[in-house]
Amino acid sequence: EPPTACREKQYLINSQCCSLCQPGQKLVSDCTEFTETECLPCSESEFLDTWNRETRCHQHKYCDPNLGLQVQQKGTSETDTICTCEEGLHCTSESCESCVPHRSCLPGFGVKQIATGVSDTICEPCPVGFFSNVSSAFEKCRPWTSCETKDLVVQQAGTNKTDVVCGPQDRQR
């Protein structure tokens, strides 16, 4: 009786179970009662990453430098090329098809996590006792100056954007 279902890594065609082509190979011809499935390796610029019956391999992704992309990992016959972004840029999506500059954290905000090729800068508001007076993609919130340790007193309170201003203590006569 002709099969109605096939084993793993097989496919049903012409009432027959044929072997799928292994990753890195494409289908040339289906199996017969006399021959196995005929498969051919993908060319250097192509890949197939699953057991398949594809008659064409997929083209490796192109990391376009005009879009700020560069190769993170070269593709093989079984894997696609992985792109990442050049220094100072990060991917706009998970598939990393284009890049945008890392955002800077505005005054009052510090860098919680520095950007990578695939993720943007993560900023956090400076909590009480900390400040940031610059727009930066690298700087964290800095602690207010401790006037006491310098034998000085606070003359002007700090904010999330400004440091405290220290001054000499008033002399008691």
Epitope: T32, E33, F34, T35, E36
Partner: antibody
Framework: EVQLVESGGGLVKPGGSLRLSCAAS????????ISWVRQAPGKGLEWVSS????????YYPDNVKGRFTISRDNAKNSLYLQMNSLRAEDTAVYYC??????????WGQGTLVTVSS | EIVLTQSPATLSLSPGERATLSCRAS??????LHWYQQKPGQAPRLLIK???QSISGIPARFSGSGSGTDFTLTISSLEPEDFAVYFC?????????FGGGTKVEIK
């Protein structure tokens, strides 16, 4: 018991024709593809033709394509090989063989075809 | 066309000895290779399928190995009835092709 019995061989002149038969028994003939394989005297094995279980697909090497025709009659459990425009190099023992899991798992005893003037 | 080259053409051995027969394919055929034995005046008989799978009724002294382009048929200890001609056959693509054969003869 699986059995394949070839017949129809004999002496034929170059350019002549011959029809070989293969009678099958001991298995469900219509479930199996069958091939013809030949062996010239003192030589190795050479594949000649194959036909699918349903008879809808036939296969030939280039050196016999257009001259030989394989066919089958599942109702009669029989396989045939019509050979036309025979040449001296077609002289050989012709075997029919059953295709089981893509292997020639059972063979007939062969029939001798001699092409000579 | 895939060409199968068998070596040696002749192997002269004594009963009880180990026989190692080689079959090389002109291009990769995965494990799509069978082995057959043929004795004088007889039809070939299937010995090993898919390069290494045993066949019911075939003695365990016959074994096959290999994948890709290089294949081996091993007879662990030759019996008198094993002296015959051995053929490999590929079924990776059309046309089906056989090797030229290796004759195992008594030394």
């Amino acid at each position: 018991e699986v059995q394949l019995v070839e017949s129809g061989g004999g002496l034929v002149k170059p350019g002549g024709s011959l029809r070989l038969s293969c009678a099958a028994s001991g298995f469900t003939f219509s479930n199996y593809g069958i091939s013809w394989v030949r062996q010239a005297p003192g030589k190795g094995l050479e594949w000649v033709s194959s036909i699918s279980s349903g008879g809808d697909n036939t296969y030939y090497p280039d050196n016999v394509k257009g001259r030989f025709t394989i066919s089958r009659d599942n109702a009669k459990n029989s396989l045939y090989l019509q050979m036309n425009s025979l040449r001296a190099e077609d002289t050989a023992v012709y075997y029919c063989a059953r295709a089981g899991e893509k292997a020639m798992d059972y063979w007939g005893q062969g029939t001798l075809v001699t092409v000579s003037s | 066309e895939i060409v199968l080259t068998q070596s040696p053409a002749t192997l002269s051995l004594s009963p009880g000895e180990r026989a190692t027969l080689s079959c090389r394919a002109s291009q990769t055929i995965n494990n799509n290779l069978h082995w057959y034995q043929q004795k004088p005046g007889q039809a070939p008989r299937l010995l090993i399928k898919y390069a290494s799978q045993s066949i019911s009724g075939i003695p365990a002294r016959f074994s096959g190995s290999g994948s890709g382009t290089d294949f081996t048929l091993t007879i662990s200890s030759l019996e008198p009835e094993d002296f015959a001609v051995y053929f490999c056959q590929q079924f990776s693509s059309w046309p089906l092709t056989f090797g030229g054969g290796t004759k195992v003869e008594i030394k």
